[in-house]
C-alpha cells in the first residue's frame, strides 16, 4: 500500500475506445498506462460522459457498458483516480468521441412516441401471452419525397426490424406494429427504438429514443366487470386485467354515473370490488379502470376504462328482463 | 404433432466444425423463435442460442459467440446451428427446442431428441 | 454469480411429497421473472413440467405444483411415483446474461 509519505503521478489509461454494441448500446474500453507506477495500489477510473447527456461514476474494471442514444454523438472521457479517506488523486483525461451520423437534422423522424400491450398469443400450444409494440412517429420537415423510414427496437439482447408498417399518401412508412416481441412485461431494462431511413436524393439522419417500460405500458382494461343493485347498495366486482403482475399489483378506479341527475363518482381502490350507496330511483352506468400500483412497479399509465355496465331503473325497460 | 428432429452430430477434432440441423413437423414453423440448448456428460442445461421467427434477430451464450452461427430456412421448415473453432467443452447432446415466451420470459415447450457432439482428438 | 441454485439430489419414497428448491438472484427470480420447470427421464429429452411460476401443460398430473417467494422457487410433487425419478431443473430469465436464459444445475430425483 502506498505510504502517506510517498509522491504518487497519476497517468491516464491508455487506447480509449468507443465501440457500438447495438441500437442505443457503447461500450467504453480502456487500458491501464504501461508507465504508470505503484500497480499494487487500488488504482480506480472515473468514467464522465459529456454529451447527449452528462453523467460520471467510477468503476474499477477497464470497460463500461452505456445505454444511451446516439443520433446526437456521443463523447466520453475516463481518468485514473487513487481515493482515499481524505483525498482524492486525479490523473488527466482521456477522451474519445463518436461523431452525430451523417444527414442534416430536418430530415430525421419526429414525434416518435411507442406503446406496449399484453395480449395473449394466438400461436402458443399453452395459454401464454405476448408483449406487443405500436410505434408511431412524423415525417422530418426536410426529408425528401421518397424517404422511407425503417423502425428497430432493442429489448436486453434482442434487436428486431419493423415488419408491418402503416403509411401516409406518399407511401411513406409512419407507424410499426409488432404483434409479438421479446420486450418484458416486468423488465427494468430500457427499450430503444431506432428510426433511419433512406432516400436517393440525400442522407437520412437517423433518430433514436430509449423507452421506460412503466411509462409506455398500455395496460388492459379489468375484465369480468359486474355491477348488481339490492336496495339501495351498488354491488361492483372485477378482475384483474391480462397482465404479468399479479393480482395484488394494481390499482382501479371506478367510475359511477348517474345517468338521471349526471353526478358523477370516482373512488379510487386496491381491491377488485366496491359497494356503493344510491337512490333506487336513478340508473347507473358503472365503468372501472386499473394501473400497476407502485407497490410493484414505477407509476404509469392507467387503462382504458373498462366497457359501462348499466343498472338501475330505467323508466324506458322493465326492471328484469324474463 | 410437434416433431423436432436433429441430425449432424458426430466426431471432431479440436478447431474442427460441424453443422447441427433440425427438422420440424407438426406446427407452422415460421411462427416460432427456435433455440439450440446443449448437455454437457453428466451435466445440466446450457442454452446455446436463439433466432427469431423471421431468422433476422439472433442471440448467443456467452461461451460460444463468435464461433457458432444459428440460422433458418422457413421454406425447408429446419433450424441449424453452424459450429466453428470447436473446443472439447463444446462437447454435448445438442438439443433444438421452440423458444416460447410467457410475457417476455422464454421457456422452451417442445425439445427434440438430440444429437451427440463430441470433440476430442 | 449469474445463474439458479438447486440441490443437487433428493430422495423420498413412494407415495411421499418432496419439494426441490431454485434459489435466484435481484437480477432473475427477484425481479419477479417468471420460472419454469423441465422434467428429464435418464437417456431422454428435457419435457416442459411447469411454466410461468406454478402453470401445468396438458398432460401433467397436478401432482405437481410450482410457487414462487423472493429469490427463489420450488417444485412439489405429491404422491411420489416410481415414474417420476428423473432429474428437473429450474429456468427462468437473467437481465444480467447475454442471452438472458439462465437453468438451475438440476436435481436428481431418487425414489426410495
Known amino acids: 500500500d502506498l505510504l502517506p509519505d510517498e509522491k504518487i503521478s497519476l497517468l491516464p489509461p491508455v487506447n480509449f475506445t468507443i465501440k457500438v454494441t447495438g441500437l442505443a448500446q457503447v461500450l467504453l474500453q480502456w487500458k491501464p498506462n504501461p508507465d504508470q507506477e505503484q500497480r499494487n495500489v487500488n488504482l480506480e477510473y472515473q468514467v464522465k460522459i459529456n454529451a447527449p447527456k452528462e453523467d460520471d461514476y467510477e468503476t474499477r474494471i477497464t470497460e463500461s457498458k452505456c445505454v444511451t442514444i446516439l443520433h446526437k454523438g456521443f463523447s466520453a472521457s475516463v481518468r485514473t483516480i487513487l481515493q482515499n479517506d481524505h483525498s482524492l488523486l486525479a490523473s488527466s483525461w482521456a477522451s474519445a468521441e463518436l461523431h452525430a451520423p451523417p444527414g442534416s437534422p430536418g430530415t430525421s423522424i419526429v414525434n416518435l412516441t411507442c406503446t406496449t400491450n399484453t395480449t395473449e398469443d394466438n400461436y402458443s400450444r399453452l395459454r401464454s401471452y405476448q408483449v406487443s409494440l405500436h410505434c408511431t412517429w412524423l415525417v422530418g420537415t426536410d426529408a425528401p419525397e421518397d424517404t422511407q423510414y425503417f423502425l428497430y427496437y432493442r429489448y436486453g439482447s434482442w434487436t428486431e426490424e419493423c415488419q408491418e408498417y402503416s403509411k401516409d399518401t406518399l407511401g411513406r412508412n409512419i407507424a410499426c406494429w409488432f404483434p409479438r416481441t421479446f420486450i418484458l412485461s416486468k423488465g427494468r431494462d430500457w427499450l430503444a427504438v431506432l428510426v433511419n431511413g433512406s432516400s436517393k436524393h440525400s442522407a437520412i439522419r437517423p433518430f433514436d429514443q430509449l423507452f421506460a417500460l412503466h411509462a409506455i405500458d398500455q395496460i388492459n382494461p379489468p375484465l369480468n366487470v359486474t355491477a348488481e343493485i339490492e336496495g339501495t347498495r351498488l354491488s361492483i366486482q372485477w378482475e384483474k386485467p391480462v397482465s404479468a403482475f399479479p393480482i395484488h399489483c394494481f390499482d382501479y378506479e371506478v367510475k359511477i354515473h348517474n345517468t338521471r341527475n349526471g353526478y358523477l363518482q370516482i373512488e379510487k381502490l386496491m381491491t377488485n370490488a366496491f359497494i356503493s350507496i344510491i337512490d333506487d330511483l336513478s340508473k347507473y352506468d358503472v365503468q372501472v379502470r386499473a394501473a400497476v400500483s407502485s407497490m410493484c412497479r414505477e407509476a404509469g399509465l392507467w387503462s382504458e376504462w373498462s366497457q359501462p355496465i348499466y343498472v338501475g331503473n330505467d323508466e324506458h325497460k322493465p326492471l328484469r328482463e324474463w | 404433432q410437434v416433431t423436432l428432429k436433429e441430425s449432424g452430430g458426430g466426431l471432431v477434432q479440436p478447431g474442427g466444425s460441424l453443422r447441427l440441423s433440425c427438422a420440424a413437423s407438426g406446427f407452422t414453423f415460421s411462427n416460432y423463435a427456435m433455440s439450440w440448448v446443449r448437455q454437457a456428460p453428466g451435466k445440466g442445461l446450457e442454452w446455446v442460442s436463439a433466432i427469431n421467427s423471421g431468422g433476422k434477430s439472433t442471440n448467443y451464450a456467452d461461451s460460444v459467440k463468435g464461433r457458432f452461427t444459428i440460422s433458418r430456412d422457413n421454406a425447408k421448415n429446419t433450424l441449424y446451428l453452424q459450429m466453428n473453432s470447436l473446443r472439447a467443452e463444446d462437447t454435448a447432446v445438442y438439443y433444438c427446442?421452440?423458444?416460447?415466451?410467457?410475457?417476455?420470459?422464454?421457456?422452451?415447450?417442445?425439445w427434440g431428441q438430440g444429437t451427440t457432439v463430441t470433440v476430442s482428438s | 454469480q449469474a445463474g439458479l441454485t438447486q440441490p443437487p439430489s433428493v430422495s423420498a419414497a413412494p407415495g411421499q411429497r418432496v419439494t426441490i428448491s431454485c434459489s435466484g438472484s435481484?437480477?432473475?427470480?427477484?425481479?419477479?421473472?417468471?420460472v419454469h420447470w423441465y422434467q428429464q427421464v435418464p437417456g431422454t429429452a428435457p419435457k416442459l413440467l411447469i411454466f410461468d411460476d406454478n402453470n401445468r401443460p396438458s398432460g401433467v398430473p397436478d401432482r405437481f405444483s410450482g410457487s414462487k417467494s423472493g429469490t427463489s422457487a420450488s417444485l412439489a410433487i405429491t404422491g411420489l411415483q416410481a415414474e417420476d425419478e428423473a432429474d428437473y431443473y429450474c429456468?427462468?430469465?437473467?437481465?444480467?446474461?447475454?442471452?438472458?436464459?439462465?437453468f438451475g444445475g438440476g436435481t436428481k430425483l431418487t425414489v426410495l
Open positions: 427446442a421452440d423458444y416460447a415466451t410467457n410475457y417476455g420470459v422464454p421457456y422452451f415447450g417442445s
Open positions: 435481484r437480477s432473475n427470480i427477484g425481479s419477479g421473472y417468471d
Open positions: 429456468q427462468s430469465y437473467d437481465s444480467s446474461l447475454s442471452g438472458h436464459v439462465v
